[in-house]
């Protein structure tokens, strides 16, 4: 019969032959012959290969370093990755996550539109007329300046974005 | 990380050039594309992400593709509209911000 | 893209002495800085990533600090084989549409 040109879903063409391939967590010893069908090992504790394979040599586990910022998020298995996380107040520098850096805080006169989380930083906003915050912070808000009226005091210092208003007693004419 | 042969490129050819890693897997990391013009420092082309994404540099953006096939472990770097100013030696790196495996890089002329 | 600037360039220094080499960014990165050891006909080899963690083998005569846009790396009790280019390289990333990556222009270190 004419050797094949192309071979079924989960086999590989070699020395004119269609082997199978090794499954998931598994790394190929030696191609199939005539007579043997193709010899798999699993991988070993810390590796992993994650797809049908005729891979030689299994992937290692990505190392989470502590130094980078790094958790581990999921312990990988013979068939996955370990996934790493940023620790708590840090998050992801890249897609990946290869390291982490800390939240950046939001500056007096701005306020957190968007708490971090572990892959994405704080998101900070101008704080419009009418808010303020007084504080670098990387979970505060603006706040709204404080209503002098609804407490029968009037504006004795205008706010800013910066600062809350401040409120005293009103004027009385004198008899 | 081993990059594809570069070689003679002619002006106005689109440059095809292919990285293959082993040891690791495509889905856990990013790889970047990084260029050196003799004689001049490193240059950032672009990145694929873990995941997928893919990010250029702003002069790269208009003719550069990143792809990758992660059965076969190659990242494919494609650059269109070719001039003697992308002469270099074209890398292949494992991260984005942290490098730290390297191919040997592979020279691209580009003249007619 | 982000722009850093290295300076001096060249700089040198006598066997057993100390350099210092600046890299400044044109935005805030936080610590997502690294620094590369360059020599000719090599690709480049990381030396410390972020801002000031060694990478693994590296001498502790390489030192890096600073973090925002400031950044420092001080080459201290030098030896011949660390004549060299190096270049910081920094970026961030918090989504396909929010990121940043640049390399520094290089800057070559002569031992005396």
């Known amino acids: 019969p004419e050797p094949p040109t192309a071979c079924r879903e989960k086999q590989y063409l070699i020395n004119s032959q269609c082997c199978s391939l090794c499954q998931p967590g598994q790394k190929l010893v030696s191609d199939c012959t005539e007579f043997t069908e193709t010899e798999c090992l699993p991988c070993g504790e810390s590796e992993f290969l994650d797809t049908w394979n005729r891979e030689t040599h299994c992937h290692q586990h990505k190392y989470c370093d502590p130094n980078l910022g790094l958790r581990v998020q999921q312990k990988g298995t013979s068939e996955t990755d370990t996934i790493c996380t940023c620790e708590e107040g840090w998050h992801c520098t890249s897609e990946a996550c290869e390291s982490c850096v800390l939240h950046r805080s939001c500056s007096p006169g701005f306020g957190v539109k968007q708490i971090a989380t572990g892959v994405s930083d704080t998101i900070c906003e101008p704080c419009p007329v009418g808010f303020f915050s007084n504080v670098s912070s990387a979970f505060e808000k603006c706040h709204p300046w404080t209503s002098c009226e609804t407490k029968d005091l009037v504006v004795q210092q205008a706010g800013t974005n910066k600062t809350d208003v401040v409120c005293g007693p009103q004027d009385r004419l004198r008899a | 990380v081993r990059e594809s042969e570069g070689g003679l490129v002619k002006p106005t050819d689109t440059l095809t050039l292919t990285c293959t890693v082993s040891g690791f897997s495509l889905s856990s990391y990013d790889m970047s594309w990084v260029r050196q013009a003799p004689g001049n420092g490193l240059e950032w082309i672009g990145a694929?992400?873990?995941?997928?994404?893919?990010y250029y540099a702003s002069w790269a953006k208009s003719r550069s593709t990143i792809t990758r096939n992660t059965n076969l472990n190659t990242v494919t770097l494609k650059m269109s509209s070719l001039t003697a100013a992308d002469t270099a030696t074209y890398f292949c790196?494992?991260?984005?911000?942290?490098?730290?495996?390297w191919g040997q890089g592979t020279l691209v002329t580009v003249s007619s | 893209d982000i722009v850093l600037t290295q300076t001096p360039s060249p700089v040198s220094g006598a066997v057993g002495g100390t350099v210092t080499i600046k890299c400044q960014a044109s935005e805030d990165i936080s610590s997502n800085l690294a620094w590369y050891q360059q020599k000719p006909g090599q690709p480049p080899k990381l030396l410390i990533f972020p801002a000031s963690n060694l990478a693994s083998g590296v001498s502790s005569r390489f030192k890096g600090s600073g973090s925002g846009t400031e950044f420092t790396l001080t080459i201290s009790d030098l030896e011949c084989a660390d004549a060299a280019t190096y270049y910081c390289q920094g970026g961030y990333w918090t989504s396909t549409s929010n990121f940043g990556n640049g390399f520094g222009g290089g800057t070559e270190v002569v031992v005396k």
């Open positions: 790196a494992r991260g984005w911000t942290r490098l730290d495996l």
């Open positions: 694929i992400g873990g995941a997928g994404g893919t």
